[in-house]
Amino acid sequence: MMTGTIETTGNISAEKGGSIILQCHLSSTTAQVTQVNWEQQDQLLAICNADLGWHISPSFKDRVAPGPGLGLTLQSLTVNDTGEYFCIYHTYPDGTYTGRIFLEVLESSVAEHGARFQIP
């Protein structure tokens, strides 16, 4: 039975041109995390495999940095980056857990800076 839960930053906002850390955390399970996939609705951003390291999709190579940890740092934000992001945890023996983050990229300095994993 899958007992784990994914904690995410939930809804976060950031300024255009700035950076944001997308971070999820799997808790309440002893399952081994074998891989984490980071996705938007219709495309892959990156994969972190416990053994093989990072894969970053070519469309994001210039502005995505691996980490910290299993998270992902998204740089040079544009308003087009607004939307849903998903962390998909592949675990053994539990299977797959999915977390959701909604990012809003704002035009001006009205972005909140209170999100737990956000870069100021």
Epitope: T34, Q35, N37, E39, D42, Q43, L44, I47, N49, A50, D51, L52, G53, W54, H55, I56, S57, P58, S59, K61, P66, H90
Partner: antibody
Framework: QVQLQQPGAELVKPGASVKLSCKAS????????IYWVKQRPGQGLEWIGG????????NFNENFKSKATLTVDKSSSTAYMQLSSLTSDDSAVYFC????????????WGQGTLVTVSA | DIVMTQSHKFMSTSVGDRVSITCKAS??????VAWYQQKPGQSPKLLIY???YRYTGVPDRFTGSGSGTDFTFTISSVQAEDLAVYYC?????????FGGGTKLEIK
């Protein structure tokens, strides 16, 4: 330029083991994973597994976990795959491949080693 | 394991024709798909990845598209040298898997 050099062929007896080599040149060996792919005569491609040369970590296709051992020798920029308890099903061409920068896709391929298992 | 299905084992075409090869994943693989070309007696070569990026030096007659479970590889104007087997492959989750291959035959 990037090169992955593999011996052309190995003839081995059933039940024996064989250690295949893949010598890398033209890039920093520890910066890119090495993967191994099997192709039986006239058949398709099958991913065996990969090794991260910087730390020796390996990831296997479950079908090959008890068949293949992946290692690296950083000093000679060489990756190895040992195949054990060989049977006729192991007769195939074995390719070593290398990924792209931060990419899992197989950008560079060796010429392949033909392993023939025969008494 | 994720199964990658190439519905056509063989495809016959003429020089100058447009040809499309399809690949269907048994489950979601996002855009983690690549296409390889293998000519007789040679190692495979990376043509397309992620799944619409042309690899260095690959002619622009080769294109790819798709997301999720359905992927297409297209040669806009087939040349005689395109005689080969074409494989799709997913790297969304291990074990990474290939399609069975589609052999392109020139009429």
């Amino acid at each position: 330029q990037v090169q992955l050099q593999q011996p052309g062929a190995e003839l081995v007896k059933p039940g024996a083991s064989v250690k295949l080599s893949c010598k890398a040149s033209g890039y920093t060996f520890i910066s890119y994973n090495i993967y191994w792919v099997k192709q039986r005569p006239g058949q398709g491609l099958e991913w065996i597994g990969g090794v991260n040369p910087s730390n020796g970590n390996t990831n296997f296709n479950e079908n090959f976990k008890s068949k293949a051992t992946l290692t690296v020798d950083k000093s000679s920029s060489t990756a190895y795959m040992q195949l054990s308890s060989l049977t006729s099903d192991d007769s195939a061409v074995y390719f070593c491949t290398r990924g792209n920068y931060y990419g899992y896709e197989f950008a560079y391929w060796g010429q392949g080693t033909l392993v023939t298992v025969s008494a | 394991d994720i199964v990658m299905t190439q519905s056509h084992k063989f495809m016959s075409t003429s020089v100058g024709d447009r040809v499309s090869i399809t690949c269907k994943a048994s489950q979601h693989v996002s855009t983690a798909v690549a296409w390889y070309q293998q000519k007789p007696g040679q190692s495979p070569k990376l043509l397309i990845y992620s799944p619409s990026y042309r690899y260095t030096g690959v002619p622009d007659r080769f294109t790819g598209s798709g997301s999720g479970t359905d992927f297409t590889f297209t040669i806009s104007s087939v040349q005689a040298e395109d005689l080969a087997v074409y494989y799709c492959q997913q790297h969304y989750s291990t074990p990474w898997t290939f399609g069975g291959g589609t052999k392109l035959e020139i009429k």
